[in-house]
């Protein structure tokens, strides 16, 4: 049987929606010919079961085996090194992988001006994994609430941050123009999930916008 | 907006150590994970070490194993790399970038977000 495998050193989730990625790290010295295994129990059914047998990579997208996250008690998975006949023993994560464990992401934020506003509409993430009855706004269907940044260019940096609970908001700009850039960081009041700030999206106010009123 | 702003590459002997800091700036920073990646001159860019931002987990490149660290300073939002026994080989623009997907660390497109670079240059 020769010597023992060491250990994959940590296993984990990282997940946003319908988009759960299994990681771990590489045991040392590890071989060409080494790769991992790994497992998959869900909650309920106290069973584990072989997901893939001899990966060779260090992260497995396990969205298609886990679905149901949303309707479920959670998961939990472990990983274990392989080489030829020799294996180690089992890496479990050390916490379960439930919805609360889901990053929350938006889809895309558009920006357009109106009378010297800023109006902007928050896309949904709509994930082609997800069955057609599991959409974002059904699975957190209360409390959506959104973190809004916005800076503008040339700007110190400094930010104004602002609050809203829908997926539309508008932003006055008090009459300046120039260049405005958006962020958007989504959560839910009700739940602990951390939220993922989007790409900034910017638009260009000049003095076309504004309606003169007499 | 997030910046990530490297420091302390510059020219250094073969076999000579340097460290190299990342520092993340801006109220919106959120990652899973940072990374190192470099650019030798006329080459493309490459994978050299990562970390997650929450919790424990590394990783490198086989041609930095046992002589590069990563480490991070959640508290100051700084990533460092520290790099022992230095080649000619290692010579190239070393760039940080913050993961800001859930897709594997060793890959370019799960970094959101990049600095400018650093040059490092070993040579006698």
């Known amino acids: 049987h020769g010597t023992e495998l060491p250990s994959p050193p940590s296993v984990w989730f990282e997940a946003e929606f319908f988009h759960h990625i299994l990681h771990w790290t590489p045991i040392p010295n590890q071989s060409e010919s080494t790769c991992y295994e790994v497992a998959l129990l869900r909650y309920g059914i106290e069973s584990w079961n072989s997901i893939s047998n001899c990966s060779q990579t260090l992260s497995y997208d396990l969205t298609a085996v886990t679905l149901d996250l949303y309707h479920s008690n959670g998961y939990r998975a472990r990983v274990r090194a392989v080489d030829g006949s020799r294996h180690s023993n089992w890496t479990v994560t050390n916490t379960r992988f439930s919805v609360d464990e889901v990053t929350l992401t938006v889809g895309s934020v558009n920006l357009e001006i109106h009378n010297g506003f800023i109006l902007g509409k928050i896309q949904l993430p709509r994930p082609k994994m997800a069955p057609a009855n599991d959409t974002y706004e059904s699975i957190f269907s209360h409390f959506r609430e959104y973190e809004i940044a916005i800076r503008k260019v040339p700007g110190n940096f400094t930010f104004t941050h602002k609050k809203v609970k829908h997926e539309n908001f508008s932003l006055l700009t008090s009459g300046e123009v120039g260049e405005f850039c958006v962020q958007v960081k989504p959560s839910v009041a009700s739940r602990s999930n951390k939220g993922m700030w989007s790409k900034e999206e910017c638009i260009s106010l000049t003095r076309q916008y504004f309606t003169v009123t007499n | 907006q997030l910046q990530l702003l490297e420091s302390g590459g510059g020219l250094v002997q073969p076999g000579g150590s340097l460290r190299l800091s990342c520092a993340a700036s801006g109220r919106t920073f959120s990652a899973y994970g940072m990374g190192w990646f470099r650019q030798a001159p006329g080459k493309g860019r490459e994978f050299v070490s990562a970390?997650?931002?929450?919790?424990?987990?590394?990783y490198y490149a086989e041609s930095v194993k046992g002589r590069f660290t990563i480490s991070k300073d959640n508290s100051k939002n700084t990533l460092y790399l520290q790099m022992n026994s230095l080649r000619a080989e290692d010579t190239a623009v070393y760039y940080c970038?913050?993961?800001?997907?859930?897709?594997?660390?060793?890959?370019?497109?799960?970094?959101?977000?990049w600095g400018q670079g650093t040059m490092v240059t070993v040579s006698s």
């Open positions: 970390i997650r931002w929450f919790g424990e987990g590394t």
């Open positions: 970038a913050a993961k800001t997907s859930p897709t594997s660390y060793l890959s370019e497109k799960s970094y959101g977000y």
